[in-house]
């Protein structure tokens, strides 16, 4: 796998754009030190590689965009892991450094003779990676060399800080917005007491921090907050689940600012421990509407409400992708490995034949079978187009009236490219406007998804609402079918007439016991009983005091 990690997908061009995609799953805990990546990924990996290759083809054949300039790329595998992505980013940088030295005539062979080899072209910008934690690490390196980075799914709020991440931009909004959307859902259903889980790492930590801050302001209490690594072992997930059960039946809702594989880990633990149906998971866009999260664990996921960045499927990508075959697709170096993994068969006689599969792949296999487009495909493509439009605008201003790369543009200055990128404004792949604010962020709109059992053993995600610019719209009937089905997630029920709340020492404000006021007391506020003054008595509703009417006794009155 370490040699596999050095596999690179190349596409020649006048200008080279780098890309980092999670072609493989992250290393498991025991393999981290070796940086040995996991299995090949389709949606987050192969589809994104193919999207890059095909989008560049479309850009190159568009006469109105970068005329006379061919865009190429160098795609590397991040394995959704900082150490691997950094190693790969250093390769990008090394290309740039060798290239710039060559420009200055500094490339010399060891024996002192001048070099005759043509080194690789420098990387002018980088698309990706997907994970916020990984993107931060990569940005820390890229910005030292003025290389702009455009992310398609790194949504951490921290990345909005331009003093720290100057060369970072994204075609997705900051997580502050989805944290708000999650709080709005919790508020809508009067869930005042919820458990919280987040993935260890920047995405989960900053997202959960925002969720907790906003919850506190809205009077929502967090029963307990837990964090876990996405690649944690079964034992860790089991322990976390057992801890979550200790807050049942009060905290039935679990807000999960989690990467998809963390959610999957939770679902698998629910299966192992027999906890299906005990919790309602409210998931962030790391889960969204991904089938790789729920596959095989649908019963455990039923009822889940998730946030999804709005991004419709890209039809032209499917038209291209579904025709791909291992015999003809040579430019994607991971494709044969993926094909064998996808169909669990061996590509006999192929360079990457995998002998672990007994069955031989037959020629009738097609990617159309069980095809699901990556839910962030639109963002990946928009990120690539953003780079193209940024370069286009730069060329227009530096090379007026010139088609192609003029001297003023060579070598490409990262500072000028960043300036140009920040001003980019174009119509995205789904007809939406792509633009960047002063923090390099894009405006966002979310869809609210609900994972449901649609029929016997048939499960799917249903769009049940949207969150746009602070406004939540939900189809409650679609989520709950009837009002009485709405899950309760509260610590204490409201007190009855004449009772006050007593919050136990060390408890959160949502947990109380109800205590009745004494006979001569009224409810002053929800936490205090007050005695009526002499000569007065609590009113019937116990919210104040009435004077006791004076009764004069006469000699002839019977005894009271």
């Amino acid at each position: 796998q370490s040699s596999e990690r050095r596999v690179v997908a190349h596409m020649p061009g006048d200008i080279i754009i780098g890309a980092l995609f999670s072609v493989h799953h992250q290393p498991t805990v025991d393999k981290v030190h070796e940086r040995k990546c996991g299995a090949v990924r389709e949606q987050y990996g192969i589809q994104r590689v193919e999207a890059m290759l095909h989008t560049l083809e479309r850009i190159n054949s568009d006469p109105t965009l970068l005329p006379n300039i061919t865009l190429g790329c160098e795609i590397r595998d991040s394995c959704w892991h900082s150490a691997v992505a950094l190693e790969q980013s250093i390769e990008f940088i090394r290309d740039s450094l060798i290239s710039s030295e060559e420009e200055e005539g500094l490339v010399r062979c060891v024996d002192g003779s001048s070099s005759s080899f043509r080194s690789k072209k420098p990387i002018v910008g980088v698309i990706g990676p997907g994970s916020s934690s990984v993107a931060i690490q990569v940005q820390n390196l890229l910005q030292l060399f003025n290389i702009p980075q455009i992310a398609y799914s790194a949504t951490s709020m921290d990345l909005s800080d331009k003093t720290l991440f100057k060369y970072f931009m994204r075609v997705v909004p900051s997580d502050a917005q989805q944290a708000r959307a999650m709080v709005d859902i919790v508020k809508r259903y009067n869930w005042t007491y919820v458990s919280a889980v987040h993935t260890e790492g920047n995405y989960g930590e900053s997202g959960m921090e925002a969720f907790k801050d906003m919850s506190a302001k809205e009077g929502i209490c967090i029963a307990h907050s837990y964090k876990i690594y996405s690649n944690a072992g079964e034992q860790s997930f089991d322990k976390l689940l057992k801890k979550l059960t200790s807050h049942l039946p009060k905290a039935r809702v679990v807000a999960c600012f989690c990467e998809g594989m963390t959610v999957r880990g939770l679902l698998m633990a629910m299966r192992r421990l027999g906890l299906a149906g005990e919790f309602l998971l409210l998931g962030s866009d790391g889960w969204a509407d991904r089938y790789d999260v729920t596959d095989g664990y649908q019963r455990e996921a039923v009822g889940g409400i998730t946030i999804k960045l709005q991004s419709p499927d890209v039809k032209w990508f499917d038209d291209y992708y579904l025709k791909l075959r291992p015999e003809t697709n040579h430019r994607n170096p991971w494709f044969q490995e993926f094909w064998q993994h996808r169909f669990q068969c061996r590509l006999e006689g192929f360079p990457q034949e995998n002998s672990k599969y007994n069955k031989t792949c037959n020629s009738s296999l097609t990617l159309k079978t069980h095809h699901v487009q990556d839910s962030k495909m639109g963002f990946v493509i928009n990120a690539i187009y953003s780079m193209a439009y940024g370069l286009h605008n730069m060329q227009m201003s530096l090379c007026p009236g010139y088609a192609g790369l003029c001297d003023a543009m060579k070598p490409i200055d990262g500072r000028k490219l960043l300036e140009s990128l920040m001003k980019t404004n174009f119509t995205g792949v789904s007809g939406d406007t792509i633009l960047f604010d002063e923090n390099g962020d894009s405006p966002g709109r979310y869809e609210i998804m609900n994972f449901k059992e649609m029929g016997k053993d048939y499960f799917d995600y249903i769009n049940v609402g949207s969150w746009d610019n602070g406004e939540l719209k939900m189809d409650d009937d679609e989520v709950w079918s009837k009002k009485s089905n709405i899950i309760r997630s509260v610590c204490s029920e409201p007190c009855e007439k004449g009772q006050i709340k007593v919050i136990r020492k060390g408890e959160v404000s949502c947990c109380w016991t109800c205590t009745p006021c004494k006979e001569n007391e009224y409810v002053f506020d929800e936490y205090t009983c007050k005695a009526c003054q002499l000569g007065s008595w609590p009113t019937d509703d116990l919210t104040g005091c009435d004077l006791i009417p004076v009764q004069y006794l006469r000699w002839g009155d019977p005894e009271p």
Epitope: T245, L248, P249, R252, L273, G274, E278
Partner: antibody, heavy 115, light 110 residues
Framework: SVEESGGRLVTPGTPLTLTCTVS????????MGWVRQAPGKGLEWIGI?????NAWYANWVKGRFTISKTSTTVDLKITSPTTEDTATYFC?????????????WGQGTLVTVSS | AYDMTQTPSSVSAAVGGTVTIKCQAS??????LSWYQQKPGQPPKLLIY???TLASGVSSRFSGSGSGTEFTLTISDLECADAATYYC????????????FGGGTEVVVK
């Protein structure tokens, strides 16, 4: 408190329902389990009903028992008793809403299955 | 399956002595293990939960230890009243369980 009732002598195949009546226990907060003990044998876990109403059973149960509940009772239905089901049946309260440990037990009710 | 094996099935010791009972889980159950005492004609009584926490009202002569798959119940300073059968129970998972309880250990006090 927890009290089992309904145990009696039945012939094989005659369905029987045992009832566990609770007082001072909120069945919407605590799980309740059923455990049986054949004469001179050890404890055998049958199943549990969570506070949520979801029920789980031991692998060997395979539809022979059904656990259900109301706000104050937990029922164990023996669908088609066999002589092997002769035992004292205990109802017990779990300390949590799901599955952990039993901190309150009933005295048990004896079921005898014989032809 | 999460199944429990208890050893020995019977043990005898003198008053004032110490008895150790072992319980092994077929797979790791962290510390979700409890111990019960049962006397003839009575229901089981909780002694220890979460492997080592003493239930309220239980003598400190009873102690529990272990985590993962290996657990131990120790009764020190043995008294006649300790003569009973002792059971361990996993409280980890209800999925794929044959019996949540161990087979039991009879303690005879001489």
């Amino acid at each position: 408190s927890v009290e089992e009732s309904g145990g009696r002598l039945v012939t094989p195949g005659t369905p029987l329902t045992l009832t566990c009546t609770v007082s001072g226990i909120d069945l919407s907060s605590n799980a309740m389990g059923w455990v049986r003990q054949a004469p001179g044998k050890g404890l055998e876990w049958i199943g549990i009903i969570y506070a949520s109403g979801n029920a789980w059973y031991a692998n060997w149960v395979k539809g022979r028992f059904t656990i259900s509940k109301t706000s104050t009772t937990v029922d164990l239905k023996i669908t088609s008793p066999t002589t092997e089901d002769t035992a004292t049946y205990f109802c017990a309260r779990d300390a949590t809403a799901t599955w952990d440990y039993f901190n309150l037990w009933g005295q048990g009710t004896l079921v005898t299955v014989s032809s | 399956a999460y199944d429990m094996t208890q050893t020995p099935s019977s043990v005898s010791a003198a008053v004032g002595g110490t008895v150790t009972i072992k319980c092994q889980a077929s797979q790791s159950i962290s510390n979700w293990l409890s111990w019960y005492q049962q006397k003839p004609g009575q229901p089981p009584k909780l002694l220890i939960y979460r492997a080592s926490t003493l239930a309220s009202g239980v003598s400190s002569r009873f102690s529990g230890s272990g985590s993962g798959t290996e657990f131990t119940l120790t009764i020190s300073d043995l008294e006649c009243a300790d003569a009973a059968t002792y059971y361990c129970q996993q409280g980890y998972s209800v999925a794929n369980v044959d019996n949540a309880f161990g087979g039991g250990t009879e303690v005879v006090v001489k």
